[in-house]
Interface confidence: low
C-alpha cells in the first residue's frame, strides 16, 4: 500500500507534585515502521527514561503507538517529541497548560 504519514499528538498530565507526564502519540500511519522518542535540549533521552507502547493496528489498515516520559513541571519548553516515518521526520513541542497539539506530518 501507499505510505500514510502519522498524525502526531502531544499531551501532558499531572504525575506527582512537581512532575508531569508528557505523552506523544502517533496514529494513522502506514507502514508500521516508525521512530518516536523524546528529546531534551535537542538530544534523545536514554531508553531507560522513556516508556513506549506497542505499534498496534488501529482497525483502518494503519497503525498507532506512543511514547511517554516524566519531566519536571516548568521544564516543558526543553522537551520535544521526535518522529521519523518513511524517510520523513518532524519535531513536536510540549503544549503549555492542559491543551494538546496534533499535527499531520506532510511530505
Amino acid at each position: 500500500g501507499s505510505t500514510v504519514p502519522p498524525m502526531v499528538n502531544v499531551t501532558r498530565s499531572e504525575a506527582s507534585e512537581g512532575n508531569i507526564t508528557v505523552t506523544c502519540r502517533a496514529s494513522g500511519f502506514y507502514p508500521w515502521n516508525i521512530t518516536l522518542s523524546w528529546r531534551q535540549d535537542g538530544v534523545s533521552l536514554s531508553h531507560d527514561t522513556q516508556q513506549w507502547g506497542d505499534v498496534l493496528p488501529d482497525g483502518n489498515g494503519t497503525y498507532q503507538t506512543w511514547v511517554a516520559t516524566r519531566i519536571c513541571q516548568g521544564e516543558e519548553q526543553r522537551f520535544t517529541c521526535y518522529m521519523e516515518h518513511s524517510g520523513n521526520h518532524s519535531t513536536h513541542p510540549v503544549p503549555s497548560g492542559n491543551s494538546h497539539h496534533h499535527h499531520h506530518h506532510h511530505h
Epitope: 535537542g42 538530544v43 536514554s46 519535531t91
Partner: antibody
Framework: EVQLVQSGAEVKKPGASVKVSCKAS????????IYWVRQAPGQGLEWIGY????????IYNQQFKDRVTITADTSTSTAYLELSSLRSEDTAVYYC???????????WGQGTLVTVSS | EIVLTQSPATLSLSPGERATLSCSAS???????LHWYQQKPGQAPRLLIY???NLASGIPARFSGSGSGTDFTLTISSLEPEDFAVYYC?????????FGQGTKVEIK
C-alpha cells in the same frame, strides 16, 4: 570529526552591538542544539542560551534575555550570537558549544574574545 | 536557579598525588545531569565526565566521578603534568544551566 569554528576577535565601544558566528561541521547541524557560554577574564563560565536549529526554538538565560539574540542558518550550519548595548562588563570570551547527552556541552568552539572599551 | 559551589578554590598538589574536587548543589540534582569539564589556559573547556561518573571520549581512566543528590566529587587518582588546570562542574537538570565557579589544580 565534529568541529565548531567561531569568528575572530572583536573590539567594540560601549553601546554598540556585536555578532559572533559559529560554523558547525562533522555532524547533522539540526540534530543538536547550539549553546552559547561566556567567560569574563579570570572568571568562570556563564550560560547565555541555546537554539534548537531544527525547529528554531530559542531559550535564553533570563539574565541576558533583553540584550541577546541567538539565531541559526541551517543552510550554512552556522549559529549566531548578537549582543547589543554593550558594556565594559561584557568583555569576555564567548564560546559556542554543541548539546550532548543530558544537557552537557560535548564539543566547543575555540572562543571569540569580545573587548568593550571606549 | 541551582547554585553549584566548588571546593576548594585552589588545590596545590604534586604530580603522582591524588586530587579530590567537590561540587555542592544548592538543591538536589539527578545524577544524570551533573557533568565535569577541564579547562587549560587559553583553551576552551572540554567535557571530562558526564552523568556524574561516565568518562567522555578520550579521557584517561585516572579520572573518575561520583556522588548523588547535592554532593558530587571528581577524583584524579594520580596527577599527571597535563592535569594541572581548572575544573568546572555543571548541572543540566533545570534552567538556567549553571556551572560551578571552578577549582584550580596547581603544581605544588
Amino acid at each position: 570529526e565534529v568541529q565548531l569554528v567561531q569568528s575572530g576577535a572583536e573590539v567594540k565601544k560601549p553601546g554598540a552591538s556585536v555578532k559572533v558566528s559559529c560554523k558547525a561541521s562533522g555532524y547533522a547541524f539540526t540534530s543538536n542544539n547550539i549553546y552559547w557560554v561566556r567567560q569574563a577574564p579570570g572568571q568562570g563560565l556563564e550560560w547565555i542560551g541555546y537554539i534548537d536549529p531544527y525547529i528554531g526554538r530559542i531559550i535564553y538565560n533570563q539574565q541576558f534575555k533583553d540584550r541577546v539574540t541567538i539565531t541559526a542558518d541551517t543552510s550554512t550550519s552556522t549559529a549566531y550570537l548578537e549582543l547589543s548595548s554593550l558594556r565594559s562588563e561584557d568583555t569576555a570570551v564567548y564560546y559556542c558549544s554543541r548539546s550532548g547527552e543530558r544537557s552537557n556541552f560535548d564539543y566547543w568552539g575555540q572562543g571569540t574574545l569580545v573587548t568593550v572599551s571606549s | 536557579e541551582i547554585v553549584l559551589t566548588q571546593s576548594p578554590a585552589t588545590l596545590s598538589l604534586s604530580p603522582g598525588e591524588r586530587a579530590t574536587l567537590s561540587c555542592s548543589a544548592s538543591s538536589s540534582i539527578s545524577s544524570n545531569y551533573l557533568h565535569w569539564y577541564q579547562q587549560k589556559p587559553g583553551q576552551a573547556p572540554r567535557l571530562l565526565i558526564y552523568r556524574t561518573s561516565n568518562l567522555a571520549s578520550g579521557i584517561p581512566a585516572r579520572f573518575s566521578g561520583s556522588g548523588s543528590g547535592t554532593d558530587f566529587t571528581l577524583t584524579i587518582s594520580s596527577l599527571e603534568p597535563e592535569d594541572f588546570a581548572v575544573y568546572y562542574c555543571q548541572q543540566g537538570g533545570s534552567l538556567p544551566l549553571t556551572f560551578g565557579q571552578g577549582t584550580k589544580v596547581e603544581i605544588k
